[in-house]
């Protein structure tokens, strides 16, 4: 069970990031799926490591003083969401932007159903060129 | 099937970083082949997370203005290399260089005699102190 | 057989970080252990996928001029330690301190009673809100 | 809207090199992998040289070979070929041309071409 999506630019104002299965994806079988463009869903109960890789462009001037902060986060049936990772950058002070990559990772047991997503500050300033922003998981 | 191999500083110009097989590496059998010392070559098709960590030093004076990008790119039999993973880092004021680190990962199916091959802006700006700069790859 | 713990802030004065077994953590069997909540020992050979991300906070004034700098490291018995992996991130400019995460991960061969850790060069400076700062593994 | 112009082109005498440059815009330049055609007067169109999407892969026809080099810089959008010990067979208009999709490399399937470039041979 294995899944890679690729990021897709948005005009829904949610800092869940956009996901497809387009380019150079993977979706292993129907034991995972790309649900509403947003949350890889597993049917199978496990341990999984999951990923993601944000690549986002912010100057610190234009930008909240708060850093850039990506979170993978973890939905289980009848559970309230909790973050499992997350990663945060400051915002650079190059002009107009500056290109930055994140990326997190981990091994953690899933429950029939469960889906994660990943969560930003601001969808606006994520890099959607090829291969910048994807996110994945694969089953132990 | 599993592969970790250490970069190596070259002499040649071109922008795909060589690897070698020294210090902690591992090449778990002959399915997988470091080619030329440039490419993670494999025999078996499949699902392979595969994943590149590249350290580099640069200043934002000293540097064109383009970041510094780093791509996980992919060659099959028979068809022009394409791009799976890419992350980007705007260069650093400090100086002389400004170390920063890259980590690029994720889930991807393979061909028989697939290479797989990491590029860089700027090879020169790459650090190949112990443990700084690798590359590898797992069957899943 | 797998492992994911979670950063924890220590009064200690070493290098080496320290981890716990809470929050949304995962030790899948007796096969791999937290020792002395300082590093991740396996009773098993063979191939493992080993990561630590970890997020900082640093200010260039404020730190020495070195960089910071995050090292995977191993334990063999009877052997001394060595160096696995190494990220390393320039201090920013932002202040107080400015946020940066790095990601570290590679395969390789553990023998029985091996051990891995993660070492900073600055531990205070370590971020220990939930999901920044984490270390794992899992056997192929 | 794709575009692709042609510069570098000139007048040249016979052993002597040129330098020609095609900015590309209007597409994802880094991705596709890019040739370069020309055409002799009088003549039909030849292919000249193709380089791949990262520059990893290059291939040249055998009258070029060893005289010729293609190069891309994929921070500019743009493609060069260098073109060393010039001979007057070498006179004609130099086209770049984009791959419609970055598949086989057997395939020579373009979809869009530039206006040319001169380049002439004569003593």
């Known amino acids: 069970i294995a899944a890679h999506v690729i990021s897709e630019a948005s005009s829904k104002t949610t800092s869940v990031l956009q996901w497809a299965e387009k380019g150079y994806y993977t979706m292993s079988n129907n034991l995972v799926t790309l649900e509403n463009g947003k949350q890889l869903t597993v049917k199978r109960q496990g341990l999984y490591y999951i990923y993601a890789q944000v690549t986002f462009c912010s100057n610190r001037e234009a930008s909240s003083q708060a850093p850039f902060i990506a979170s993978l986060c973890l939905k289980s049936p009848g559970r309230f969401e909790r973050i499992l990772l997350r990663a945060a950058n400051t915002h650079s002070s190059a002009k107009p932007c500056g290109q930055q990559s994140i990326h997190l990772g981990g091994v953690f047991e899933l429950q029939p159903g469960a889906s994660v997503f990943v969560n930003v500050t601001d969808p606006s300033q994520v890099s959607h060129g090829t291969g910048f922003t994807s996110f994945g998981l694969l089953k132990l | 099937i599993a592969a970790h191999v250490i970069s190596e500083a070259s002499s040649k110009t071109t922008s795909v970083l060589q690897w070698a097989e020294k210090g902690y590496y591992t090449m778990s059998n002959n399915l997988v082949t470091l080619e030329n010392g440039k490419q993670l070559t494999v025999k078996r098709q499949g699902l392979y997370y595969i994943y590149a960590q590249v350290t580099f030093c640069s200043n934002r004076e000293a540097s064109s203005q383009a970041p510094f990008i780093a791509s996980l790119c992919l060659k099959s039999p028979g068809r022009f290399e394409r791009i799976l993973l890419r992350a980007a880092n705007t260069h650093s004021s400090a100086k002389p260089c400004g170390q920063q680190s890259i980590h690029l990962g994720g889930v991807f199916e393979l061909q028989p005699g697939a290479s797989v091959f990491v590029n860089v802006t700027d090879p020169s700006q790459v650090s190949h102190g112990t443990g700084f700069t690798s590359f590898g790859l797992l069957k899943l | 057989i797998a492992a994911h713990v979670i950063s924890e802030a220590s009064s200690k004065t070493t290098s080496v970080l320290q981890w716990a077994e809470k929050g949304y953590y995962t030790m899948s069997n007796n096969l791999v252990t937290l020792e002395n909540g300082k590093q991740l020992t396996v009773k098993r050979q063979g191939l493992y996928y080993i990561y630590a991300q970890v997020t900082f906070c640093s200010n260039r004034e404020a730190s020495s001029q070195a960089p910071f700098i995050a090292s995977l490291c191993l334990k063999s018995p009877g052997r001394f330690e060595r160096i696995l992996l190494r990220a390393a991130n320039t201090h920013s400019s932002a202040k107080p301190c400015g946020q940066q995460s790095i990601h570290l991960g590679g395969v390789f061969e553990l023998q029985p009673g091996a051990s891995v850790f993660v070492n900073v060069t600055d531990p205070s400076q370590v971020s220990h809100g939930t999901g920044f700062t984490s270390f794992g593994l899992l056997k192929l | 809207e794709v575009q692709l112009l042609e510069s570098g082109g000139g007048l040249v005498q016979p052993g002597g090199s040129l330098r020609l440059s095609c900015a590309a815009s209007?597409?994802?330049?880094?991705?596709?992998?890019m040739s370069w055609v020309r055409q002799a007067p009088g003549k039909g169109l030849e292919w000249v040289s193709t380089?791949?999407?990262?520059?990893?892969?290059?291939y040249y026809a055998d009258s070029v070979k060893g005289r010729f080099t293609i190069s891309r810089d994929n921070s500019k959008n743009t493609l060069y070929l260098q073109m060393n010990s010039l001979r007057a067979e070498d006179t004609a208009v130099y086209y770049c041309?984009?791959?419609?999709?970055?598949?086989?490399?057997?395939?020579?399937?373009?979809?869009?071409w530039g206006q040319g470039t001169l380049v002439t041979v004569s003593s």
């Open positions: 209007g597409f994802t330049f880094e991705l596709y992998p």
């Open positions: 041309a984009k791959f419609k999709r970055s598949g086989k490399t057997d395939d020579t399937n373009f979809d869009y």
């Open positions: 380089i791949s999407p990262t520059g990893l892969l290059t």
